[in-house]
């Protein structure tokens, strides 16, 4: 969490951003909140990016003002206009690209004063893994697949019964470049699995951590997966 204050002494307002990650090829959100004002017409929101000459987005007098917008963001940005009055200056970014990563500044002016806060925006690819029993294999084998990751993640297997066990000797992980030549498909195979046990396939890079669980019993197979972004630090 980054909390910024205005520089002009008592005429300063608190602006808060949260470092976040964008999944390339999806819409992303850059979070920013501020002390609200009573009048929408008195609020100015400016989003800037380090190293970019034009503005990322500007919202003033209750509407978008895009005349100074940088070409790389044209047609891609929006604030949540109906939420500005309650102090939400978050930015929606359409079709996140790797090149959108960087340091952004959320700069706010209201009748109470000015304030700003920086935000580190990371971009990459992350997806939910799916773990299945590989019936084609000669021995009891599990196959963990996740369609899109970038940068290249690490894959670690764990089991409920053998907690702390190292499965690197009985697993094999491969990374297959997807057609757009950036993201990769992750496939990890775990051999010699035992029945009545829960196995977890954990995929992690510096942006996200995802886990796929599978419980295999003689009568059924239960699956569960979840994904968590790692760098949500507020500023």
């Amino acid at each position: 969490l980054i909390i910024g204050f205005g520089i002009s002494g008592r005429h300063s307002i608190t602006v808060t951003t949260v470092a976040s990650a964008g999944n390339i090829g999806e819409d992303g959100i850059l979070s920013c909140t501020f002390e609200p004002d009573i009048k929408l017409s008195d609020i100015v929101i400016q989003w800037l990016k380090e190293g970019v000459l034009g503005l990322v987005h500007e919202f003033k007098e209750g509407k978008d003002e895009l005349s100074e917008q940088d070409e790389m963001f044209r047609g891609r940005t929006a604030v949540f206009a109906d939420q500005v009055i309650v102090g939400n200056a978050s930015l929606r970014l359409k079709n996140v690209q790797l090149t959108d990563a960087g340091t952004y500044k959320c700069y706010i002016i209201t009748s109470k004063g000015k304030g700003n806060a920086n935000l580190e925006y990371k971009t990459g690819a992350f997806s939910m893994p799916e773990v299945n029993v590989d019936y084609n294999a000669s021995s009891e084998t599990l196959r963990c697949e996740a369609p899109r990751w970038f940068p290249q993640p690490t894959v670690v297997w764990a089991s409920q019964v053998d907690q702390g066990a190292n499965f690197s000797e009985v697993s094999n992980t491969s990374f297959e470049l997807n057609s757009e030549n950036v993201t990769m498909k992750v496939v990890s195979v775990l051999y010699n699995v035992t029945i009545n046990n829960t196995y977890s396939c954990m995929i992690e890079n510096d942006i996200a951590k995802a886990t796929g669980d599978i419980k295999v019993t003689e009568s059924e197979i239960k699956r569960r997966s979840h994904l968590q972004l790692l760098n949500s630090k507020a500023s």
Epitope: I24, G25, E26, D27, K63, D64, L66, R74, A81, R148
Partner: antibody, heavy 116, light 109 residues
Framework: QVQLVESGGVLVKPGGSLRLSCAAS????????MSWIRQAPGMGLEWVSY????????YYTDSVKGRFTISRDSAKNSLYLQMNSLRAEDTAVYYC?????????WGQGTLVTVSS | EIVLTQSPGTLSLFPGERATLSCRAS???????LAWYQQKPGQSPRLLIY???SRATGIPDRFSGSGSGTDFTLTISRLEPEDFAVYYC??????????FGQGTKLEIK
Amino acid sequence: QVQLVESGGVLVKPGGSLRLSCAASGFTLSDYYMSWIRQAPGMGLEWVSYISSSGSTIYYTDSVKGRFTISRDSAKNSLYLQMNSLRAEDTAVYYCARDGVGFDYWGQGTLVTVSS
Amino acid sequence: EIVLTQSPGTLSLFPGERATLSCRASQSVSSSYLAWYQQKPGQSPRLLIYAASSRATGIPDRFSGSGSGTDFTLTISRLEPEDFAVYYCQQYGSSPLYTFGQGTKLEIK
């Protein structure tokens, strides 16, 4: 140059199925949001379905949810629309369109007629 | 659900005149996500304006877009014979994800 070519539109009976294809050239499909948009005879444009660049996010307009499925094959650089349980009101020219900043490229359209 | 209402439904003008087409949204739309299209009979739509006011590649400068929030305008400063067509506005990002206006038919008087 950028080109989108739809195919697969025919006359089909109510309740029937159809698969539309859209072959893209001059750009990589998976770099862009892609949509299917339709236009009933003499009517306006209606957005039908969307797939994100990543392929992870898919949306449909309410009237086709549960009946239509959008997909793509990155290796073939093609977009598809599987249409099941077709109704008379699905009769339209179906366009695939690339969303760069707005729908900057459209196919020529393929006519789907649902009639008994 | 966001609704885009275009007016007038039909606009009859002479070549050389100025055309002003309106698109009103039922709730606020980001200027970044508002586009205008032209469609001629038997043809696919063509992108004219994106981000409310930016001309698409190859579009003559007699076409201009303006507006923000809920009110957007497409202006054709001096009508050419090839400009008579149907015009649609379109938004992205609300529910449903994409919405088109019902269209304005621009016809020769």
